[in-house]
């Protein structure tokens, strides 16, 4: 044996945004013939010697960070990457408006707010259809989402979340959903995200809500363009995946 | 109360063998993992095994793999520890420890230790 | 070599508060395993003292507190006390082959 084994894949069916009370399976899955696997749960660090875990009724105390390993022999495999379970409904829902309409003319910019009624300073944004998200940290109860020069792609429904930074695996309930319209369109295949698309229900959301976006800027406006990874910042912003650190 | 109590030690010539034993009370004994830990005669504490709880998953300090073998016993509330190819480097007094356990979880520290029992290895 | 790395000996007065640190790396107190601390007094087998980094036993004095913060972590012992005198072993876990590593202890003296 040189070097360790590849590493397995850790996912949560049907998804890692787990409403409060609902269930969640985390499945961890390597190469075939695998002779025992590792589940951990981060913080505080714990294991159990199976290749599943099944969480009948969400609690808030099943939210965190997993990873899992397994073992051929004596040889270990290196880890899988961290799935961030999420427990949401814990507090109220946000409210998502559009500012100055929820309609829009193509190429003119448009803000979503979500508005929380805590002091949150972590909102996300998601777009049906979208493998991300948008997550901008604000210090205060509202955070903007700036969108300019509105695209064909920029058409959808989304919703936000709200959280307290320092219970990063605790979120809101999702927001009513908004639909945003961008009008006067000329639509051309090369206008539409390529990215697969998902039901936007909690209940059938992707497994992970990784790779993000995360967007910390100024308050001024930025450019949101689309690409087949979702929507990602242009030049001059970082793009980066979603994963807080211990 | 939770009891660890090993025995097995003693004198034994470079290339020996020396089975250890640990006998545990006081707690459900297949719920846990368990380990051995060894301190050298004024040194520190090194991890040398571990099994879990159902004796699938074991573990060795590179230092011993291939030599020494971990076993359990959960009928018997017993762990073991088979020691082969001894060298003067093995000479060490060897605690049985447990892991601690919650629920359905196995954590990464240990909360109970046996008084250990001396092994020797020397012409 | 120990994994974890601590001083060898510490010392300080009756009354007085002295830290013990242990550094890891990356693939064990950095890759985010919790840090746990020993006392072993002379003679006997070790016990356990601070769990989770910070976390005391039932039965162990609020004199004792234990912190983590990115691949290191302390212990701190305030108002000493004579029978605090003893070796003090850090631990955590190593990631890349699933083993338990300890520092590599350090000798607290209570002095006068």
């Known amino acids: 044996q040189s070097g360790p084994l590849p590493k397995p894949s850790l996912q949560a069916q049907p998804s890692s945004l787990v409403p409060l009370g609902q269930s969640v399976i985390l499945r961890c899955q390597g190469p075939p013939d695998v002779d025992l696997y590792r589940l951990e749960k981060l913080k505080p660090e714990k294991y159990e010697d199976q290749d599943f875990l099944f969480i009948p009724t969400m609690e808030r105390s099943n939210a965190g960070r997993y990873r899992c390993s397994y073992q051929n022999g004596s040889h270990w495999s290196l880890p899988s990457d961290q799935l961030e379970l999420i427990a949401t409904g814990v507090y109220a829902k946000p409210s998502l408006s559009a500012h100055p309409s929820s309609a829009v003319p193509q190429g003119r910019d448009v803000t979503l707010k979500c508005q929380s009624p805590y002091s949150f300073d972590e909102f996300v944004l998601y777009k049906e259809g979208d493998t991300g998200s948008y997550k901008r940290p604000e210090k205060w109860y509202r955070a903007n989402f700036p969108i300019i020069t509105v695209t064909a792609a920029h058409s959808g429904t989304y919703r936000c979340y709200s959280f307290s930074s320092s219970s990063p695996y605790l979120w809101s309930a999702p927001s009513d959903p908004l639909v945003l319209v961008v009008t006067g369109l000329s639509a051309t295949p090369s206008q539409v995200p390529t990215e697969e698309s998902f039901p936007v229900t909690e209940s059938s959301r992707r497994p992970s809500i990784l790779p993000t976006n995360k967007i910390s800027t100024t308050e001024k406006p930025m450019n949101i363009t689309a690409s087949p990874e979702g929507l990602s910042p242009p030049f001059g912003f970082a793009h980066q995946h979603y994963a807080k650190g211990n | 109360q939770v009891q660890l109590v090993e025995s097995g030690g003693g004198l034994v010539k470079p290339g020996g063998s020396l089975r250890l034993s640990c006998a545990a009370s006081?707690?459900?004994?297949?719920?846990?993992?368990m380990s051995w830990i060894r301190q050298a005669p004024g040194k520190g504490l090194e991890w040398v095994s571990s099994?879990?709880?159902?004796?699938?998953?074991?573990d060795y300090a590179a230092s011993v793999k291939g030599r020494f073998t971990i076993s359990r016993d959960n009928a018997k509330n017993s762990l073991y520890l088979q020691m082969n190819s001894l060298r003067a480097e093995d000479t060490a007094v060897y605690y049985c420890?447990?892991?601690?356990?919650?629920?359905?979880?196995?954590?990464?520290?240990?909360?109970?230790w046996g008084q250990g029992t001396l092994v020797t290895v020397s012409s | 070599q120990s994994v974890l790395t601590q001083p060898p000996s510490v010392s300080g007065a009756p009354g007085q508060r002295v830290t013990i640190s242990c550094t890891g790396s990356?693939?064990?107190?950095?890759?985010?395993?919790?840090v746990h601390w020993y006392q072993q007094l002379p003679g006997t087998a070790p016990k356990l003292l601070i769990y989770g980094n910070s976390n005391r036993p039932s039965g162990v004095p609020d004199r004792f507190s234990g912190s983590k913060s990115g691949t290191s972590a302390s212990l701190a012992i305030t108002g000493l006390q004579a029978e605090d005198e003893a070796d003090y072993y850090c631990q955590s876990h190593d990631l890349g082959a699933h083993v338990w590593v300890f520092g590599g202890g350090t000798k607290l003296t209570v002095l006068g």
């Open positions: 099994v879990g709880s159902e004796g699938k998953f074991i």
């Open positions: 990356s693939s064990n107190i950095g890759a985010g395993y919790d």
């Open positions: 006081g707690f459900s004994f297949s719920d846990h993992y």
């Open positions: 420890a447990r892991h601690y356990r919650e629920f359905r979880w196995h954590y990464y520290y240990f909360d109970y």
